[in-house]
Amino acid sequence: VPRWRQQWSGPGTTKRFPETVLARCVKYTEIHPEMRHVDCQSVWDAFKGAFISKHPCNITEEDYQPLMKLGTQTVPCNKILLWSRIKDLAHQFTQVQRDMFTLEDTLLGYLADDLTWCGEFNTSKINYQSCPDWRKDCSNNPVSVFWKTVSRRFAEAACDVVHVMLNGSRSKIFDKNSTFGSVEVHNLQPEKVQTLEAWVIHGGREDSRDLCQDPTIKELESIISKRNIQFSCKNIYRPDKFLQCVKNPEDSSCTSEI
């Protein structure tokens, strides 16, 4: 008789999840010499321990504490790039500008990027059928709590000038309900962070509007200013050219506005 299993609204755990996490950890520690001391089996044990045998709507940041501890790493605090709703371009940027880091360039972010996972209460099984959806089921699910936890720590570590890439094609360029808007903005430390610089990425070729004047950007500026952090904003009118100029800053066409 098949055991009754909770049906959630979201997709189930990514197939081969344990193998993927372990393989990513090994690959990351091989590429990053400063993380060679990390024991990937321990990292997996800590990851697994955060959600296995626990109700997937009752996960806490404390559950992830061992993983946070084992995965702590040194990231230059003045080289942090946050992003919201524009992950691909942010990652393309840090792949070129190697001295800057998104969360997914850190070990913990790299391990979990684009993966889904959850367990079941009182069994050691991973649920590959379905996992809770943040909106339809519950917010305290393993994936959401993980990203909230690592995002908070990442923002807390930032210093000097922090950059954030925002999607100018969206109706809410700055969304208070995004991870950036609800977690990272509120965990930047005013005693360490001098300025938040927003890069608003334009979508349309002929879009010459100043999206830094968008009401949601003004809202972001207000939130940041109230936290005693300076705010600046730049339009990136041509993201393709922007990336090209990051690769080849000497190019003559890179002196004009991008």
Partner: antibody, heavy 117, light 107 residues
Framework: QVQLQQSGAELVRPGTSVKMSCKAA????????IEWVKQRPGHGLEWIGD????????DYNEKFKGKATLTADTSSSTAYMQLSSLTSEDSAIYYC??????????WGQGTSVTVSS | DIQMNQSPSSLSASLGDTITITCHAS??????LGWYQQKPGNIPKLLIY???NLHTGVPSRFSGSGSGTGFTLTISSLQPEDIATYYC?????????FGGGTKLEIK
């Protein structure tokens, strides 16, 4: 080999502060947590808090918040703990140790603090 | 805070004996348990990490087992140099907490 060398014994007056050091050698200082532990006779071992020198992350036992302040200087591979508003209850041996798999694999020789008027 | 209940608090055994010390956590700590030995007048030394892994240089007569809430440290073929107090410590959640210690004496 991994070594943690702690500063010498301290005899201090009540109400004052003390700052002790823990110099690390034999490993990459910025890659491991430094743990701080208090030991008083008859009281066993008490975890005070820890610091990750590479990122300046710190975590404290609630009991020691406001009492202990942890810092680190990466240029000299040295961790520091400052204890403030000292009372007789703070008389103890204080150890630093290196974190490993959520345990503590190498310990300093300890710094004895005696609070007396 | 997670309580670590260690038993017995003291233990007397003969050379060559096998002894067991237990540590019970007040909540699930997975495998995040360390065992330490502290000889009189000395510093604590790590014996076992992650419940069952022997730290570098520790004799193989020491072994650890358990996960979740119940853990044991076993010393087989007791030697005179094993006279010490033994502590367990959980690393699952802050604040890290230690057991009260087990004082081992030789009969």
């Amino acid at each position: 080999q991994v070594q943690l060398q702690q500063s010498g014994a301290e005899l201090v007056r009540p109400g004052t502060s003390v700052k002790m050091s823990c110099k690390a050698a034999g490993y990459t200082f910025t890659n491991h947590w430094i743990e701080w532990v208090k030991q008083r006779p008859g009281h066993g071992l008490e975890w005070i808090g820890d610091i990750f020198p590479g990122g300046g992350y710190t975590d404290y036992n609630e009991k020691f918040k406001g009492k202990a302040t942890l810092t680190a200087d990466t240029s000299s591979s040295t961790a520091y703990m400052q204890l403030s508003s000292l009372t007789s209850e703070d008389s103890a041996i204080y150890y630093c140790a290196r974190g490993r798999d959520l345990a503590m694999d190498y310990w300093g020789q300890g710094t004895s603090v005696t609070v007396s008027s | 805070d997670i309580q670590m209940n260690q038993s017995p608090s003291s233990l007397s055994a003969s050379l060559g004996d096998t002894i067991t010390i237990t540590c019970h956590a007040s909540q699930n700590i997975n495998v995040w348990l360390g065992w330490y030995q502290q000889k009189p007048g000395n510093i604590p030394k790590l014996l076992i990490y992650k419940a069952s892994n022997l730290h570098t240089g520790v004799p193989s007569r020491f072994s650890g087992s358990g996960s979740g809430t119940g853990f044991t440290l076993t010393i087989s073929s007791l030697q005179p140099e094993d006279i010490a107090t033994y502590y367990c410590q959980q690393g699952q959640s802050y604040p890290y907490t230690f057991g009260g210690g087990t004082k081992l004496e030789i009969k």
